[in-house]
Structures are given as C-alpha cells and as structure tokens.
C-alpha cells in the first residue's frame, strides 16, 4: 500500500494519500460517465468489509476492454497484498448478486469516503 500512487509517483505514498487518490479516481469515473459505464457490464457484488480491496479487484478484473476503470484496477491492486487474476473469487463476493459496474463504483466510492472521513486508511 505504501508504494501506491501511480507509475509516475516519485516515492512511497502514505496510506491516506493512496486512499484519497482512489476516491478521486472513482469520483472522476462517476462524474464523467455519459454512456453506460463499461457498456453496462455486470460484476459480482461484494461485502464492503475487511478484505474488500481484493474483493473489489477480483470483481472488476473480470471486466475487460473498459478503459474507464483500468486506472481503478491498477490502484486497487496496490491495496491488495496478493496477485489477483480474472476468474478468482473470495468469500467476500455476494455470489448470487450481480450489479452494473456503475453501481459497483458508486457503492465503493461511498464506502471509501466514509472510511476516509473517519481516518481509517488500512
């Protein structure tokens, strides 16, 4: 997590900065959304609890050919301690519920904003 912040980052990034940057990227996606995000692709819903960064990445990594969320996927990988590949699922997925990527991003954004406001970065 300390080395998150994008490829051009000059050095280690504090957890608070990394989380803030992820929030701001999700805001950008939400604000700039004109056509249905990722052509209306559906992803597995997740439980927004401990381990949610890996779970979020596992859901979003199954969306291919969607440039709008590529940066988010890269940023989430910085929060997840293990390598995530397509088709991988954790117990945090609500496996009977699929939602649109746009709703997934909106839900994740709200949850991360709450964590950030409360000063919970890890």
């Amino acid at each position: 997590l300390t080395c998150l912040g994008g490829f051009a980052s000059p050095g280690p990034v504090p957890p608070s900065t990394a989380l803030r940057e992820l929030i701001e990227e999700l805001v950008n996606i939400t604000q700039n959304q004109k056509a249905p995000l990722c052509n209306g692709s559906m992803v597995w819903s997740i439980n927004l609890t401990a381990g949610m960064y890996c779970a979020a990445l596992e859901s979003l990594i199954n969306v291919s050919g969607c440039s709008a969320i590529e940066k988010t996927q890269r940023m989430l990988s910085g929060f997840c301690p293990h390598k995530v590949s397509a088709g991988q699922f954790s117990s945090l997925h609500v496996r009977d519920t699929k939602i649109e990527v746009a709703q997934f991003v909106k839900d994740l954004l709200l949850h991360l904003k709450k964590l950030f406001r409360e000063g919970q970065f890890n």
Epitope: R20, I23, E24, V27, T30, Q31, D107, L110, K113, K114, F116, R117, E118, G119
Partner: antibody, heavy 119, light 107 residues
Framework: QVTLKESGPVLVKPTETLTLTCTVS????????VQWIRQPPGKALEWLGV???????SFNSVLKSRLTISRDTSKSQVVLTMTNMDPVDTATYYC??????????????WGQGTLVTVS | DIQMTQSPSSLSASVGDRVTITCLAS??????LAWYQQKPGKAPKLLIY???RLQDGVPSRFSGSGSGTDFTLTISSLQPEDFATYYC?????????FGGGTKVEIK
C-alpha cells in the same frame, strides 16, 4: 427545484430531548447525503452529523452520545434527535444537502434553519 | 480535529474594492475546502467548493485558490450585495469544521 425545510419546537427545557425534522424535495434521500449543522447566535457554524445516502450515519464525536439521525425515505424526511438539551445548545439548526458526487463533503443546498432556544 | 482559522475576523471595504480573505487549516486538507456567504437571518450559501470550483449561479468575481493548509477567497470587485459574513469549511476529515467567519462591512 431542491428545497429543504426544518421543523420542530422553538423552545425546549433543559434536560429535554430535541427532535427536528428535515423535509426535502427535488432530490432523493437514497442518492444524496443530508447533513445537520448548527449555529449559536452570533457564532460560527458547527457540524453535527450526516445521514448517508445508504442509511448509515456519522456524527461529530463531541456530541455523538447525544445524537441520533434517522430517515423515512417514503416521506423524504430526515430526523435529528438530541438528548439532554442545555442552554448552550441554543442555536439555529440547519439541515443541508451534501454535494455528494465529489471527493470532499460540502453543503450545496440549505434549509432556512430553525432557531431552538433552551430555557 | 482540524482547526480552521480565518483572517481577518472583520474588514471594512468600499464598493469596487478587491477583497481577500484567508483560511488556514491546522493540517493538510489537500484541496477539500469550501467557502460560504451568510447574510443576517439567512442560511449560508455555497460559493466555492474544492478550493476553486465556482458553484452554479455564483458571480465570477468570486474566486478561490490554495492547497494544503493555506487558502484564499477573493472578491475581485466588491458589490453592494457582497456585504456579508464569509466562512470556510474543510470537507476532508470528520468532524467537518468551519472557520470562525469574516464579516465584510461597508467602509
């Protein structure tokens, strides 16, 4: 047109519980957060707490033990309850809509406010 | 808590003057700062959010700048309707906090 309107008692006695209702129109409580702020006469603004769009709440830690915020989405209402009122709680109480689709929390629409006197 | 310190607490100015109000945060708040205008007996009105983004309908004579801990609200040419109290607010960390206000009075 976005509007918010606070309603409730203008006078409460010390130790009593204050209940204020914020009735909104022009937006959905499931899409926007509603914040509560107060302002003692002649003084600055103080944030009390928020009803998030998903129904969660967060509070100013100084007042957390005295505050509850609830909502009735069918009535487009958010309710603030503050227990054990004291004369220092005399203030104009505002509800406000949060800008929401932004990284920061700010207040883009406000109610007209209701002056609550504790005496 | 993040303390927000505004200066000056009051100022006297004339119509047409350029007015600058500063807001100092006790810690880094990135650009998570908003400015409000309040007139007596009225609710505050949002002028600027995210340091420099003008709220819809707000005249372009209002502008904001800064980053980190130091922020500025500028009114390029004061108009009669601008005499009011101005507050800054950080939207970075709970509890959300406001500055003590700057009262802009007629000279």
């Amino acid at each position: 047109q976005v509007t918010l309107k606070e309603s409730g008692p203008v006078l409460v006695k010390p130790t009593e519980t204050l209940t204020l209702t914020c009735t909104v129109s022009g937006f959905s409580l499931t899409n926007y957060h509603v914040q509560w702020i107060r302002q003692p006469p002649g003084k600055a603004l103080e944030w009390l707490g928020v009803m998030w769009s998903d129904g969660d709440t967060s509070f100013n830690s100084v007042l957390k033990s005295r505050l509850t915020i609830s909502r009735d989405t069918s009535k487009s209402q958010v309710v603030l309850t503050m227990t054990n009122m004291d004369p220092v709680d005399t203030a104009t109480y505002y509800c406000a809509r949060d800008g929401t689709i932004a990284a920061m929390d700010y207040f883009d629409y406000w109610g007209q406010g209701t002056l609550v006197t504790v005496s | 808590d993040i303390q927000m310190t505004q200066s000056p607490s009051s100022l006297s100015a004339s119509v047409g003057d350029r007015v600058t109000i500063t807001c100092l945060a006790s810690e880094d708040i990135s650009n998570y700062l908003a400015w409000y205008q309040q007139k007596p007996g009225k609710a505050p009105k949002l002028l600027i959010y995210h340091t420099s983004r003008l709220q819809d309908g707000v005249p372009s004579r209002f502008s904001g700048s800064g980053s980190g801990t130091d922020f500025t609200l500028t009114i390029s040419s004061l108009q009669p309707e601008d005499f009011a109290t101005y507050y800054c607010q950080q939207g970075y960390r709970f509890p959300l906090t406001f500055g003590g206000g700057t009262k802009v009075e007629i000279k």
